[in-house]
Amino acid sequence: QGWQAFKNDATEIIPGLREYPEPPQELENNQTMNRAENGGRPPHHPYDTKDVSEYSCRELHYTRFVTDGPCRSAKPVTELVCSGQCGPARLLPNAIGRVKWWRPNGPDFRCIPDRYRAQRVQLLCPGGAAPRSRKVRLVASCKCKRLTRFHNQSELKDFGPETARPQKGRKPRPRARGAKANQAELENAY
């Protein structure tokens, strides 16, 4: 496969793997996060269930090479794509749920990236050019965000507050960004 065959958009889906939507070159600024530091009471939403954990959001894993101009990563990276219907987990089928479970005039829920992580990648370049080292931004986790129909369509609301980021040396919270767990997954991808 020639170098010219690689996409110049930092993505290259590996043949034979399921092809999921490609991440954008630049992250779009269309997410309004609404979080509080170190606790705080989440806002009451009449259509929410009592337990936030009941809401499910599909996290699809896919593996790809990343490219930077003519240069391509030496190894593929595995990341998440946030996809599928967002809704109470008990109502979501195994396949991507398409059933509208919400009430009329109720809120929509969108599955979007929650946290990002960095992964070091070595990029090999054609023509004997020096290799490059980059840190690629990957989605680390997805979350359901509430889109209130009565408000501006772009207004996304969180279920509730989150605490501050952990300090080095302390164990990260499950939802904190981290690459260590994903590294093993990447190594096992091939």
Epitope: A10, P23, P24, Q25, E26, L27, N29, Q31, T32, M33, R35, D68, D114, R115, Y116, R117, A118, Q119, R120, A130, P131, R132, S133, R134, K135, V136, R137, A140, R165, P166, Q167, K168, G169, R170, P172, A176, R177, G178, A179, K180
Partner: antibody
């Protein structure tokens, strides 16, 4: 476009603490990796610490370990740097700096205007 | 902790070429140190010129370029302009911990 606006100048006594804020606009804090850098008058830049997206943790420079705390209020997209047990040598301009939320992590792309902290008895 | 070294001062003639270097006390600087270069003028916040060894930014003038040279990170200025007179800092990434060099005062004379 990421923009950072820092709190105003502070004058503190030795032994006191100072808390500098850095308000983010254009993106949300959770999309960014925030770092803090200081510069004493007539001296060079000194990295104090910041969020490492590889580990998902905040890392502090050894020199400031135990004296600095970096926190974030994601409800207001404001980052804070608190330095305690101040001494005269902590007199400096304190900067917050962040990446540009691009596909590749490029740190220190956007800088706040700086906050002058003067420690004097 | 690692020490990052730079030339304290350098002078270049207008239109001339100059190379600033950045070394590490831990050994050779490599692409895995993701070298950064910053320019700072008096009374201003620093601004990034180069990231990840050689990656320029939209605001970086074409006359600036980054590279690795003899085990050090290098910033080359080709065709110096009077407005390039400033302090230049390099920054190295030691696995998430960053260390700035002492800075190079560049004079365009």
């Amino acid at each position: 476009e990421v923009q950072l606006v820092q709190s105003g100048a502070e004058v503190k006594k030795p032994g006191a603490s100072v808390k500098v804020s850095c308000k983010v606009s254009g993106y949300t804090l959770t999309e960014l990796s925030m770092h803090w850098v200081r510069q004493a008058p007539g001296k060079g830049l000194e990295w104090m610490g910041g969020f490492d997206p590889e580990d998902g943790e905040t890392i502090y420079a050894q020199k400031f370990q135990g004296r600095v705390t970096m926190t974030e209020d994601t409800s207001t997209d404001t980052a804070y740097m608190e330095l305690s047990s101040l001494r005269s040598e902590d007199t400096a301009v304190y900067y917050c700096a962040t990446d540009s939320a691009g596909y590749w992590y490029k740190f220190f792309q956007h800088w706040g205007q700086g906050t002058l902290v003067t420690v004097s008895s | 902790q690692a020490v990052v070294t730079q030339e304290p001062s350098l002078t270049v003639s207008p239109g001339g070429t100059v190379t600033l270097t950045c070394g590490s006390s831990t050994g050779a600087v490599t692409i895995d140190h993701y070298p950064y270069w910053f320019q700072q003028k008096p009374g201003q916040a620093p601004r990034t010129l180069i990231s990840d060894t050689d990656d320029k930014h939209s605001w970086t003038p074409a006359r600036f370029s980054g590279s690795l040279l003899g085990g050090k990170a290098a910033l080359t200025l080709s065709g110096a302009q009077p407005e390039d007179e400033a302090e230049y800092y390099c920054l190295l990434d030691y696995g998430g911990t960053f260390v700035f060099g002492g800075g190079t005062k560049l004079t365009v004379l």
